[in-house]
Protein backbone atom coordinates (compact mmCIF):
# COMPACT_ATOMS: atom_id res chain seq x y z
CA UNK A 1 0.00 0.00 0.00
CA UNK A 2 2.70 2.61 0.94
CA UNK A 3 4.09 1.71 -2.36
CA UNK A 4 1.25 2.39 -4.09
CA UNK A 5 0.67 5.76 -2.70
CA UNK A 6 4.09 6.61 -2.94
CA UNK A 7 4.75 5.48 -6.70
CA UNK A 8 0.84 8.09 -7.07
CA UNK A 9 2.98 10.95 -5.55
CA UNK A 10 5.91 11.05 -7.46
CA UNK A 11 5.85 12.85 -10.94
CA UNK A 12 5.73 10.26 -13.90
CA UNK A 13 8.72 12.15 -15.09
CA UNK A 14 10.91 10.72 -12.24
CA UNK A 15 10.22 7.35 -13.15
CA UNK A 16 11.68 8.20 -16.17
CA UNK A 17 8.23 7.29 -18.76
CA UNK A 18 9.47 9.83 -21.46
CA UNK A 19 7.55 9.27 -24.34
CA UNK A 20 6.31 10.97 -27.90
CA UNK A 21 3.89 10.52 -30.82
CA UNK A 22 4.63 13.17 -33.41
CA UNK A 23 2.39 13.92 -36.63
CA UNK A 24 4.08 15.36 -39.99
CA UNK A 25 3.81 19.24 -40.27
CA UNK A 26 5.54 19.83 -44.03
CA UNK A 27 8.99 18.76 -45.01
CA UNK A 28 11.32 21.06 -46.14
CA UNK A 29 12.80 22.62 -49.29
CA UNK A 30 14.48 20.82 -51.98
CA UNK A 31 17.37 20.15 -50.82
CA UNK A 32 16.18 19.30 -47.46
CA UNK A 33 15.55 15.88 -46.70
CA UNK A 34 14.12 15.92 -43.08
CA UNK A 35 10.43 15.88 -42.22
CA UNK A 36 9.60 18.34 -39.87
CA UNK A 37 6.90 16.89 -36.92
CA UNK A 38 4.51 18.64 -34.49
CA UNK A 39 2.55 17.05 -31.21
CA UNK A 40 0.41 18.63 -28.87
CA UNK A 41 -2.93 17.62 -27.78
CA UNK A 42 -4.55 20.84 -29.98
CA UNK A 43 -2.95 19.22 -32.92
CA UNK A 44 -5.10 15.75 -32.25
CA UNK A 45 -2.99 12.60 -30.72
CA UNK A 46 0.09 13.44 -30.39
CA UNK A 47 1.93 14.53 -27.74
CA UNK A 48 5.22 15.39 -25.89
CA UNK A 49 6.05 13.77 -22.61
CA UNK A 50 9.75 14.76 -21.90
CA UNK A 51 10.90 14.80 -25.25
CA UNK A 52 11.20 18.75 -26.62
CA UNK A 53 10.54 19.67 -30.35
CA UNK A 54 13.24 21.76 -32.12
CA UNK A 55 12.21 23.48 -35.57
CA UNK A 56 10.72 20.21 -36.17
CA UNK A 57 12.66 18.06 -35.03
CA UNK A 58 12.86 15.55 -31.94
CA UNK A 59 15.09 16.03 -28.95
CA UNK A 60 15.54 13.71 -26.49
CA UNK A 61 15.74 14.79 -22.39
CA UNK A 62 16.24 12.03 -20.57
CA UNK A 63 19.34 8.87 -20.70
CA UNK A 64 17.89 5.45 -21.89
CA UNK A 65 17.06 3.15 -23.97
CA UNK A 66 13.55 3.60 -26.95
CA UNK A 67 12.13 2.25 -28.82
CA UNK A 68 11.76 4.39 -32.01
CA UNK A 69 8.49 3.97 -34.55
CA UNK A 70 8.11 5.10 -37.54
CA UNK A 71 5.25 4.75 -40.25
CA UNK A 72 5.55 7.00 -43.65
CA UNK A 73 2.86 7.06 -46.60
CA UNK A 74 3.31 8.43 -49.62
CA UNK A 75 0.54 10.80 -50.45
CA UNK A 76 0.41 10.21 -54.06
CA UNK A 77 1.08 6.41 -54.52
CA UNK A 78 0.45 3.65 -56.50
CA UNK A 79 3.13 1.00 -56.78
CA UNK A 80 3.86 1.70 -60.42
CA UNK A 81 4.21 5.23 -58.87
CA UNK A 82 6.74 4.27 -56.05
CA UNK A 83 8.99 2.06 -58.51
CA UNK A 84 9.36 4.63 -61.20
CA UNK A 85 10.27 6.94 -58.45
CA UNK A 86 12.46 4.35 -56.51
CA UNK A 87 14.64 4.74 -54.84
CA UNK A 88 12.66 6.90 -52.49
CA UNK A 89 14.36 6.22 -48.73
CA UNK A 90 13.62 7.20 -45.06
CA UNK A 91 16.09 7.16 -43.15
CA UNK A 92 15.59 8.08 -39.24
CA UNK A 93 18.57 9.02 -37.25
CA UNK A 94 20.69 11.33 -34.49
CA UNK A 95 21.62 14.37 -36.31
CA UNK A 96 22.56 16.10 -33.65
CA UNK A 97 25.34 16.49 -31.43
CA UNK A 98 27.72 16.13 -34.45
CA UNK A 99 29.89 14.08 -32.70
CA UNK A 100 26.78 11.72 -32.39
CA UNK A 101 25.62 11.47 -35.68
CA UNK A 102 24.57 8.06 -36.99
CA UNK A 103 21.66 6.40 -39.26
CA UNK A 104 19.49 4.34 -37.12
CA UNK A 105 16.75 2.97 -39.08
CA UNK A 106 16.47 2.94 -43.05
CA UNK A 107 13.98 1.41 -45.69
CA UNK A 108 13.34 2.17 -49.02
CA UNK A 109 9.56 1.86 -50.55
CA UNK A 110 10.34 -0.24 -53.82
CA UNK A 111 6.99 -1.15 -54.81
CA UNK A 112 5.41 -0.10 -51.73
CA UNK A 113 3.60 3.37 -50.37
CA UNK A 114 4.07 2.92 -46.75
CA UNK A 115 7.16 2.10 -44.67
CA UNK A 116 7.05 0.98 -40.92
CA UNK A 117 9.66 -0.13 -38.64
CA UNK A 118 10.90 -0.04 -35.14
CA UNK A 119 13.94 -0.48 -33.23
CA UNK A 120 15.23 -0.03 -29.63
CA UNK A 121 18.40 1.91 -29.36
CA UNK A 122 19.79 3.69 -26.95
CA UNK A 123 19.89 7.32 -27.00
CA UNK A 124 21.04 10.71 -24.94
CA UNK A 125 20.14 13.76 -23.10
CA UNK A 126 20.34 16.49 -26.03
CA UNK A 127 20.06 14.07 -29.07
CA UNK A 128 18.42 15.07 -32.00
CA UNK A 129 16.49 12.84 -34.36
CA UNK A 130 15.95 13.59 -37.79
CA UNK A 131 14.07 11.63 -40.38
CA UNK A 132 14.96 12.23 -43.95
CA UNK A 133 12.93 11.04 -46.64
CA UNK A 134 15.24 11.29 -50.01
CA UNK A 135 13.46 11.31 -53.44
CA UNK A 136 10.74 13.28 -55.14
CA UNK A 137 7.77 11.85 -53.51
CA UNK A 138 5.85 13.97 -50.89
CA UNK A 139 4.51 12.23 -47.69
CA UNK A 140 1.06 12.04 -46.52
CA UNK A 141 -0.10 14.27 -43.58
CA UNK A 142 -2.80 12.34 -42.73
CA UNK A 143 -2.57 11.26 -38.91
CA UNK A 144 -3.12 7.41 -39.51
CA UNK A 145 -0.68 7.61 -41.84
CA UNK A 146 2.53 9.16 -41.18
CA UNK A 147 3.48 9.54 -37.51
CA UNK A 148 7.04 9.07 -35.50
CA UNK A 149 7.63 8.17 -31.80
CA UNK A 150 9.76 7.50 -29.23
CA UNK A 151 9.53 5.72 -25.62
CA UNK A 152 11.59 5.42 -23.38
CA UNK A 153 12.37 2.11 -22.12
CA UNK A 154 15.16 1.42 -19.53
CA UNK A 155 18.06 3.39 -18.04
CA UNK B 1 14.73 -5.07 -0.06
CA UNK B 2 11.38 -3.44 1.07
CA UNK B 3 9.88 -2.23 -2.02
CA UNK B 4 10.81 -5.36 -3.96
CA UNK B 5 8.60 -7.00 -1.58
CA UNK B 6 6.05 -4.61 -1.61
CA UNK B 7 6.35 -4.58 -5.39
CA UNK B 8 5.74 -8.70 -5.46
CA UNK B 9 2.45 -8.45 -3.54
CA UNK B 10 0.50 -5.64 -5.43
CA UNK B 11 -1.38 -6.72 -7.88
CA UNK B 12 -0.20 -6.31 -11.62
CA UNK B 13 -2.99 -4.58 -12.41
CA UNK B 14 -2.50 -1.76 -10.09
CA UNK B 15 0.79 -1.52 -11.39
CA UNK B 16 -0.60 -0.66 -15.12
CA UNK B 17 0.38 -3.29 -17.13
CA UNK B 18 -2.59 -3.48 -19.37
CA UNK B 19 -1.57 -6.38 -22.19
CA UNK B 20 -3.39 -8.16 -24.79
CA UNK B 21 -2.23 -10.09 -27.82
CA UNK B 22 -4.83 -11.36 -29.96
CA UNK B 23 -5.15 -13.92 -33.02
CA UNK B 24 -7.62 -13.79 -35.64
CA UNK B 25 -10.94 -15.47 -35.26
CA UNK B 26 -13.39 -14.70 -38.25
CA UNK B 27 -14.19 -12.25 -40.26
CA UNK B 28 -17.88 -10.94 -40.62
CA UNK B 29 -20.14 -11.25 -43.17
CA UNK B 30 -19.91 -9.52 -46.63
CA UNK B 31 -21.22 -5.49 -45.44
CA UNK B 32 -18.90 -5.89 -42.56
CA UNK B 33 -15.68 -4.88 -43.11
CA UNK B 34 -14.06 -5.90 -39.36
CA UNK B 35 -11.78 -8.45 -37.90
CA UNK B 36 -13.19 -10.74 -35.26
CA UNK B 37 -10.46 -11.33 -32.72
CA UNK B 38 -10.37 -13.86 -30.07
CA UNK B 39 -7.68 -14.23 -27.08
CA UNK B 40 -6.43 -16.78 -23.97
CA UNK B 41 -4.11 -18.93 -23.07
CA UNK B 42 -6.41 -22.00 -24.64
CA UNK B 43 -5.31 -20.99 -27.88
CA UNK B 44 -2.41 -20.70 -27.71
CA UNK B 45 0.29 -17.31 -27.31
CA UNK B 46 -2.73 -15.11 -27.55
CA UNK B 47 -4.06 -13.28 -24.07
CA UNK B 48 -5.90 -10.47 -22.64
CA UNK B 49 -4.55 -8.76 -18.76
CA UNK B 50 -6.91 -5.65 -18.56
CA UNK B 51 -8.39 -5.40 -21.75
CA UNK B 52 -11.02 -7.32 -22.71
CA UNK B 53 -13.12 -8.76 -25.70
CA UNK B 54 -16.42 -7.54 -26.84
CA UNK B 55 -17.89 -9.23 -29.87
CA UNK B 56 -14.53 -9.93 -30.91
CA UNK B 57 -13.36 -6.47 -30.84
CA UNK B 58 -11.02 -4.88 -27.86
CA UNK B 59 -12.47 -3.20 -25.23
CA UNK B 60 -9.84 -0.88 -22.64
CA UNK B 61 -9.82 -1.15 -19.24
CA UNK B 62 -7.68 1.59 -18.03
CA UNK B 63 -6.73 5.35 -19.45
CA UNK B 64 -3.39 5.61 -20.92
CA UNK B 65 -1.18 6.20 -23.54
CA UNK B 66 -0.72 2.77 -25.55
CA UNK B 67 1.38 1.11 -27.83
CA UNK B 68 -1.04 -0.34 -30.56
CA UNK B 69 0.36 -3.11 -33.02
CA UNK B 70 -1.21 -4.98 -35.84
CA UNK B 71 0.46 -7.53 -38.68
CA UNK B 72 -2.27 -9.08 -41.33
CA UNK B 73 -0.77 -11.38 -44.19
CA UNK B 74 -3.93 -12.16 -46.80
CA UNK B 75 -4.56 -15.86 -47.27
CA UNK B 76 -4.07 -16.65 -50.84
CA UNK B 77 -1.82 -13.95 -52.16
CA UNK B 78 0.80 -13.18 -54.47
CA UNK B 79 2.42 -9.70 -55.53
CA UNK B 80 -0.03 -10.05 -58.57
CA UNK B 81 -3.34 -10.90 -56.76
CA UNK B 82 -2.80 -8.21 -53.57
CA UNK B 83 -2.43 -5.40 -57.16
CA UNK B 84 -4.83 -7.10 -58.91
CA UNK B 85 -7.30 -6.43 -55.73
CA UNK B 86 -6.10 -2.87 -55.16
CA UNK B 87 -7.35 -1.29 -52.74
CA UNK B 88 -7.17 -3.65 -50.03
CA UNK B 89 -6.50 -1.41 -46.68
CA UNK B 90 -6.56 -2.28 -43.26
CA UNK B 91 -7.52 0.56 -40.69
CA UNK B 92 -7.06 0.38 -37.03
CA UNK B 93 -9.12 3.06 -35.02
CA UNK B 94 -11.48 3.32 -31.91
CA UNK B 95 -15.02 2.80 -33.22
CA UNK B 96 -16.99 3.04 -30.10
CA UNK B 97 -17.74 5.08 -28.21
CA UNK B 98 -19.03 6.94 -31.11
CA UNK B 99 -18.30 10.27 -29.86
CA UNK B 100 -14.20 8.88 -30.28
CA UNK B 101 -14.58 7.41 -33.38
CA UNK B 102 -11.11 7.59 -34.87
CA UNK B 103 -8.99 6.31 -37.21
CA UNK B 104 -5.31 5.54 -35.71
CA UNK B 105 -3.38 3.53 -38.32
CA UNK B 106 -3.94 3.11 -41.94
CA UNK B 107 -1.86 1.14 -44.48
CA UNK B 108 -2.58 -0.24 -48.22
CA UNK B 109 -1.50 -3.66 -48.90
CA UNK B 110 -0.36 -2.58 -53.11
CA UNK B 111 1.87 -5.58 -53.96
CA UNK B 112 2.35 -6.75 -50.92
CA UNK B 113 0.66 -9.46 -48.97
CA UNK B 114 1.52 -8.54 -45.44
CA UNK B 115 1.42 -5.24 -43.67
CA UNK B 116 2.87 -4.91 -40.16
CA UNK B 117 2.88 -1.25 -38.02
CA UNK B 118 2.75 0.36 -34.86
CA UNK B 119 2.15 3.70 -32.94
CA UNK B 120 1.50 5.09 -29.91
CA UNK B 121 -1.96 6.63 -28.73
CA UNK B 122 -3.77 7.56 -25.91
CA UNK B 123 -7.20 5.70 -24.97
CA UNK B 124 -9.49 5.75 -22.52
CA UNK B 125 -11.42 2.96 -20.16
CA UNK B 126 -14.03 1.89 -22.47
CA UNK B 127 -12.16 2.27 -26.05
CA UNK B 128 -13.16 0.04 -28.64
CA UNK B 129 -10.40 -0.90 -31.24
CA UNK B 130 -12.09 -2.11 -34.40
CA UNK B 131 -9.78 -3.56 -37.06
CA UNK B 132 -11.38 -3.06 -40.96
CA UNK B 133 -10.16 -4.74 -43.85
CA UNK B 134 -11.52 -3.45 -47.15
CA UNK B 135 -11.17 -5.29 -50.16
CA UNK B 136 -12.33 -8.68 -51.32
CA UNK B 137 -9.28 -10.59 -49.88
CA UNK B 138 -9.17 -12.83 -46.74
CA UNK B 139 -6.80 -12.69 -44.19
CA UNK B 140 -4.85 -15.74 -42.77
CA UNK B 141 -5.89 -16.62 -39.57
CA UNK B 142 -1.91 -18.78 -39.01
CA UNK B 143 -1.27 -16.81 -35.57
CA UNK B 144 2.38 -15.77 -36.77
CA UNK B 145 1.00 -14.33 -39.91
CA UNK B 146 -1.93 -12.07 -38.59
CA UNK B 147 -2.12 -10.85 -35.26
CA UNK B 148 -3.30 -7.40 -33.05
CA UNK B 149 -2.45 -6.05 -29.97
CA UNK B 150 -2.16 -3.58 -27.31
CA UNK B 151 0.30 -2.78 -24.27
CA UNK B 152 -0.14 0.40 -21.47
CA UNK B 153 2.73 2.10 -21.90
CA UNK B 154 2.01 5.59 -18.81
CA UNK B 155 -0.32 7.18 -17.63
CA UNK C 1 10.90 9.85 -1.65
CA UNK C 2 11.65 6.49 0.09
CA UNK C 3 10.38 4.78 -2.84
CA UNK C 4 12.57 6.49 -5.56
CA UNK C 5 15.90 5.23 -3.22
CA UNK C 6 14.79 2.13 -2.83
CA UNK C 7 14.55 1.95 -6.81
CA UNK C 8 18.06 3.52 -7.37
CA UNK C 9 19.39 1.06 -4.74
CA UNK C 10 17.68 -2.28 -6.62
CA UNK C 11 19.44 -3.56 -9.38
CA UNK C 12 17.74 -2.96 -12.91
CA UNK C 13 17.63 -6.59 -13.50
CA UNK C 14 15.29 -6.91 -10.36
CA UNK C 15 13.11 -4.73 -11.73
CA UNK C 16 12.51 -6.93 -14.91
CA UNK C 17 13.95 -4.77 -17.31
CA UNK C 18 15.51 -7.57 -20.19
CA UNK C 19 16.05 -5.89 -23.42
CA UNK C 20 18.43 -6.81 -26.06
CA UNK C 21 18.97 -5.58 -29.70
CA UNK C 22 21.40 -7.56 -31.75
CA UNK C 23 22.99 -6.95 -35.03
CA UNK C 24 23.57 -9.61 -37.93
CA UNK C 25 26.73 -11.04 -37.79
CA UNK C 26 26.76 -13.65 -40.47
CA UNK C 27 24.29 -16.32 -42.01
CA UNK C 28 25.25 -19.85 -41.87
CA UNK C 29 26.06 -22.19 -44.92
CA UNK C 30 23.30 -23.24 -47.75
CA UNK C 31 21.38 -25.57 -45.89
CA UNK C 32 21.62 -23.78 -42.21
CA UNK C 33 18.49 -20.50 -42.65
CA UNK C 34 19.05 -19.21 -39.24
CA UNK C 35 20.60 -15.56 -38.88
CA UNK C 36 23.20 -15.34 -36.56
CA UNK C 37 23.23 -12.28 -34.61
CA UNK C 38 25.63 -10.32 -32.10
CA UNK C 39 25.91 -7.59 -29.22
CA UNK C 40 27.24 -5.43 -27.70
CA UNK C 41 29.02 -1.99 -26.95
CA UNK C 42 31.80 -2.31 -29.11
CA UNK C 43 29.82 -3.28 -31.97
CA UNK C 44 28.14 -0.43 -32.10
CA UNK C 45 24.46 0.32 -30.77
CA UNK C 46 23.56 -3.12 -29.79
CA UNK C 47 23.43 -4.49 -26.49
CA UNK C 48 21.90 -7.05 -24.25
CA UNK C 49 21.05 -6.33 -20.76
CA UNK C 50 19.69 -9.91 -19.21
CA UNK C 51 19.24 -11.85 -22.43
CA UNK C 52 22.05 -14.12 -23.47
CA UNK C 53 23.80 -15.09 -27.35
CA UNK C 54 23.93 -19.04 -27.61
CA UNK C 55 26.15 -19.44 -30.70
CA UNK C 56 24.59 -16.93 -32.06
CA UNK C 57 20.64 -17.37 -31.41
CA UNK C 58 19.04 -15.00 -28.06
CA UNK C 59 18.36 -17.19 -25.50
CA UNK C 60 15.87 -15.79 -22.32
CA UNK C 61 16.44 -15.43 -19.26
CA UNK C 62 13.30 -14.23 -17.70
CA UNK C 63 9.87 -15.17 -17.87
CA UNK C 64 7.52 -12.63 -19.02
CA UNK C 65 5.75 -11.53 -21.35
CA UNK C 66 7.87 -9.67 -24.42
CA UNK C 67 7.90 -7.05 -27.37
CA UNK C 68 9.72 -9.29 -29.89
CA UNK C 69 10.80 -7.05 -32.97
CA UNK C 70 12.61 -7.77 -36.36
CA UNK C 71 13.75 -5.54 -39.29
CA UNK C 72 15.49 -7.88 -42.31
CA UNK C 73 16.79 -6.20 -45.34
CA UNK C 74 17.91 -8.55 -48.70
CA UNK C 75 21.43 -6.77 -49.35
CA UNK C 76 21.45 -6.62 -52.89
CA UNK C 77 17.85 -6.43 -53.98
CA UNK C 78 15.36 -4.65 -56.32
CA UNK C 79 11.60 -5.45 -56.95
CA UNK C 80 12.23 -7.03 -59.55
CA UNK C 81 15.06 -9.15 -57.68
CA UNK C 82 12.64 -9.95 -54.76
CA UNK C 83 9.84 -11.41 -57.21
CA UNK C 84 11.83 -13.58 -59.16
CA UNK C 85 13.31 -15.14 -55.70
CA UNK C 86 9.60 -15.69 -53.91
CA UNK C 87 9.25 -16.82 -52.13
CA UNK C 88 11.60 -15.29 -49.58
CA UNK C 89 10.51 -15.95 -45.93
CA UNK C 90 11.53 -14.77 -42.50
CA UNK C 91 10.01 -17.00 -39.61
CA UNK C 92 10.77 -15.81 -35.70
CA UNK C 93 10.36 -18.91 -33.73
CA UNK C 94 11.16 -20.45 -30.76
CA UNK C 95 13.80 -23.16 -31.37
CA UNK C 96 14.82 -24.90 -28.26
CA UNK C 97 13.61 -26.68 -25.66
CA UNK C 98 12.29 -29.07 -29.04
CA UNK C 99 9.31 -28.99 -26.57
CA UNK C 100 8.54 -25.45 -27.02
CA UNK C 101 8.98 -25.22 -30.35
CA UNK C 102 6.78 -22.88 -32.45
CA UNK C 103 6.80 -20.28 -35.33
CA UNK C 104 6.13 -16.74 -33.83
CA UNK C 105 6.58 -14.56 -36.45
CA UNK C 106 6.61 -15.09 -40.04
CA UNK C 107 6.98 -12.58 -43.16
CA UNK C 108 7.52 -12.86 -46.71
CA UNK C 109 9.22 -10.28 -48.85
CA UNK C 110 7.02 -10.74 -52.04
CA UNK C 111 8.14 -7.43 -54.17
CA UNK C 112 9.63 -5.48 -51.13
CA UNK C 113 13.10 -5.62 -50.35
CA UNK C 114 12.71 -4.72 -46.40
CA UNK C 115 10.23 -6.81 -43.97
CA UNK C 116 9.70 -5.44 -40.42
CA UNK C 117 7.25 -6.27 -37.65
CA UNK C 118 6.85 -7.17 -33.89
CA UNK C 119 4.45 -9.10 -31.50
CA UNK C 120 3.88 -9.67 -27.80
CA UNK C 121 4.67 -13.37 -26.84
CA UNK C 122 4.94 -14.83 -23.38
CA UNK C 123 8.37 -16.37 -23.22
CA UNK C 124 10.03 -18.68 -20.48
CA UNK C 125 13.67 -18.30 -19.01
CA UNK C 126 15.90 -21.12 -21.32
CA UNK C 127 13.73 -20.30 -24.64
CA UNK C 128 15.88 -20.00 -27.56
CA UNK C 129 14.93 -17.83 -30.57
CA UNK C 130 15.74 -18.48 -33.69
CA UNK C 131 15.39 -16.16 -37.32
CA UNK C 132 14.95 -18.57 -40.17
CA UNK C 133 15.75 -16.71 -43.49
CA UNK C 134 14.60 -19.15 -46.46
CA UNK C 135 15.54 -18.40 -49.82
CA UNK C 136 18.79 -18.09 -51.65
CA UNK C 137 19.22 -13.80 -50.79
CA UNK C 138 21.77 -13.01 -48.34
CA UNK C 139 20.64 -10.00 -45.85
CA UNK C 140 21.97 -7.12 -45.26
CA UNK C 141 24.63 -6.26 -42.67
CA UNK C 142 24.24 -3.07 -42.51
CA UNK C 143 22.93 -2.07 -38.77
CA UNK C 144 20.04 0.57 -39.87
CA UNK C 145 19.00 -2.07 -42.48
CA UNK C 146 18.76 -5.59 -40.40
CA UNK C 147 18.27 -5.75 -36.73
CA UNK C 148 16.89 -8.20 -33.91
CA UNK C 149 15.49 -7.47 -30.77
CA UNK C 150 13.33 -8.28 -27.27
CA UNK C 151 11.78 -6.16 -24.57
CA UNK C 152 10.75 -7.66 -21.71
CA UNK C 153 7.13 -6.21 -20.70
CA UNK C 154 5.33 -7.46 -17.91
CA UNK C 155 5.25 -10.81 -16.08
CA UNK D 1 45.24 -2.55 -40.85
CA UNK D 2 44.24 -4.35 -43.87
CA UNK D 3 44.87 -3.60 -47.18
CA UNK D 4 43.39 -4.47 -50.24
CA UNK D 5 44.76 -4.63 -53.96
CA UNK D 6 42.35 -4.82 -56.93
CA UNK D 7 44.06 -6.30 -60.44
CA UNK D 8 42.58 -7.69 -63.46
CA UNK D 9 40.82 -4.87 -65.03
CA UNK D 10 41.23 -3.62 -68.77
CA UNK D 11 39.69 -2.89 -72.16
CA UNK D 12 37.79 -5.94 -73.31
CA UNK D 13 35.10 -6.49 -76.24
CA UNK D 14 31.79 -6.67 -76.05
CA UNK D 15 31.19 -10.37 -75.16
CA UNK D 16 34.61 -11.04 -73.65
CA UNK D 17 35.87 -12.42 -70.45
CA UNK D 18 37.72 -10.43 -68.10
CA UNK D 19 38.85 -11.83 -64.11
CA UNK D 20 39.18 -9.39 -61.55
CA UNK D 21 41.51 -10.17 -58.57
CA UNK D 22 41.61 -8.76 -55.21
CA UNK D 23 44.63 -9.69 -52.31
CA UNK D 24 43.77 -9.19 -48.46
CA UNK D 25 47.30 -8.74 -46.68
CA UNK D 26 47.69 -7.10 -42.94
CA UNK D 27 45.86 -8.44 -40.19
CA UNK D 28 43.21 -10.66 -41.57
CA UNK D 29 40.84 -12.34 -39.00
CA UNK D 30 36.85 -12.64 -38.65
CA UNK D 31 35.88 -11.61 -42.40
CA UNK D 32 32.22 -11.93 -42.68
CA UNK D 33 32.06 -11.07 -46.56
CA UNK D 34 33.91 -10.30 -49.36
CA UNK D 35 32.13 -7.99 -51.91
CA UNK D 36 32.91 -7.01 -55.21
CA UNK D 37 31.12 -3.29 -56.01
CA UNK D 38 31.41 -1.14 -59.11
CA UNK D 39 31.12 2.56 -59.84
CA UNK D 40 29.79 3.89 -63.13
CA UNK D 41 30.83 7.56 -64.27
CA UNK D 42 28.21 10.03 -62.52
CA UNK D 43 26.34 6.37 -61.03
CA UNK D 44 26.21 5.48 -57.38
CA UNK D 45 28.30 2.67 -56.04
CA UNK D 46 26.58 -0.87 -56.89
CA UNK D 47 26.74 -4.11 -55.30
CA UNK D 48 27.54 -6.22 -57.51
CA UNK D 49 28.41 -9.93 -55.99
CA UNK D 50 28.67 -11.06 -52.31
CA UNK D 51 30.93 -14.28 -50.57
CA UNK D 52 30.26 -14.63 -47.25
CA UNK D 53 32.00 -16.54 -44.84
CA UNK D 54 29.60 -19.73 -45.25
CA UNK D 55 30.47 -19.81 -49.18
CA UNK D 56 27.07 -18.60 -49.85
CA UNK D 57 26.86 -16.24 -52.73
CA UNK D 58 24.79 -13.73 -54.20
CA UNK D 59 24.33 -11.33 -57.29
CA UNK D 60 22.86 -7.97 -58.43
CA UNK D 61 20.31 -8.69 -61.15
CA UNK D 62 22.44 -7.42 -63.90
CA UNK D 63 25.23 -9.82 -63.60
CA UNK D 64 23.26 -13.16 -62.74
CA UNK D 65 24.76 -15.82 -64.64
CA UNK D 66 27.34 -13.86 -65.91
CA UNK D 67 29.66 -13.19 -63.10
CA UNK D 68 31.00 -15.57 -60.19
CA UNK D 69 32.80 -14.57 -57.13
CA UNK D 70 34.92 -17.29 -55.81
CA UNK D 71 37.95 -16.69 -53.53
CA UNK D 72 41.15 -19.33 -52.68
CA UNK D 73 41.24 -21.56 -50.07
CA UNK D 74 43.26 -19.18 -47.52
CA UNK D 75 40.48 -16.54 -48.20
CA UNK D 76 42.97 -13.73 -48.77
CA UNK D 77 42.23 -13.65 -52.40
CA UNK D 78 38.82 -12.92 -54.15
CA UNK D 79 38.09 -12.91 -57.79
CA UNK D 80 35.33 -12.14 -59.71
CA UNK D 81 35.35 -13.81 -63.19
CA UNK D 82 33.32 -11.61 -65.62
CA UNK D 83 32.04 -13.61 -68.51
CA UNK D 84 29.79 -12.15 -71.39
CA UNK D 85 30.73 -8.88 -70.74
CA UNK D 86 28.55 -5.29 -72.20
CA UNK D 87 29.03 -2.03 -72.54
CA UNK D 88 27.25 -1.02 -69.17
CA UNK D 89 29.35 -3.16 -67.41
CA UNK D 90 32.38 -0.28 -68.12
CA UNK D 91 32.80 0.96 -64.43
CA UNK D 92 35.62 1.42 -61.98
CA UNK D 93 35.03 -2.11 -59.85
CA UNK D 94 36.16 -2.22 -56.15
CA UNK D 95 37.13 -4.58 -53.73
CA UNK D 96 35.06 -4.84 -50.18
CA UNK D 97 36.26 -6.50 -47.22
CA UNK D 98 33.65 -6.97 -44.62
CA UNK D 99 34.98 -8.14 -41.06
CA UNK D 100 32.89 -9.59 -38.31
CA UNK D 101 33.15 -6.66 -35.98
CA UNK D 102 31.84 -4.52 -38.49
CA UNK D 103 35.36 -2.93 -40.22
CA UNK D 104 35.19 -2.09 -43.89
CA UNK D 105 38.35 -1.86 -45.75
CA UNK D 106 38.57 -1.02 -49.27
CA UNK D 107 40.32 -1.27 -52.47
CA UNK D 108 41.77 1.67 -54.72
CA UNK D 109 39.58 0.26 -57.77
CA UNK D 110 40.40 -1.46 -60.98
CA UNK D 111 38.93 -0.08 -64.23
CA UNK D 112 36.53 -2.28 -66.84
CA UNK D 113 35.81 -0.64 -70.28
CA UNK D 114 33.53 -2.99 -72.61
CA UNK D 115 34.01 -1.03 -75.68
CA UNK D 116 34.46 -2.24 -79.50
Known amino acids: QRFAQAQQQLPLESLGWDVAELQLNHTGPQQDPRLYWQGGPALGRSFLHGPELDKGQLRIHRDGIYMVHIQVTLAICSSTTASRHHPTTLAVGICSPASRSISLLRLSFHQGCTIASQRLTPLARGDTLCTNLTGTLLPSRNTDETFFGVQWVRP | QRFAQAQQQLPLESLGWDVAELQLNHTGPQQDPRLYWQGGPALGRSFLHGPELDKGQLRIHRDGIYMVHIQVTLAICSSTTASRHHPTTLAVGICSPASRSISLLRLSFHQGCTIASQRLTPLARGDTLCTNLTGTLLPSRNTDETFFGVQWVRP | QRFAQAQQQLPLESLGWDVAELQLNHTGPQQDPRLYWQGGPALGRSFLHGPELDKGQLRIHRDGIYMVHIQVTLAICSSTTASRHHPTTLAVGICSPASRSISLLRLSFHQGCTIASQRLTPLARGDTLCTNLTGTLLPSRNTDETFFGVQWVRP | QVQLQESGGGLVQPGGSLRLSCVAS????????MNWYRQAPGKQRELVAI???????DYADSVKGRFTISSDNAKTTVYLQMNSLKPEDTALYYC??????????WGQGTQVTVSS
Open chain 4, 96 to 105: NLQTISYHDF
Open chain 4, 51 to 57: LNRAGRT
Open chain 4, 26 to 33: GSIFSIAR
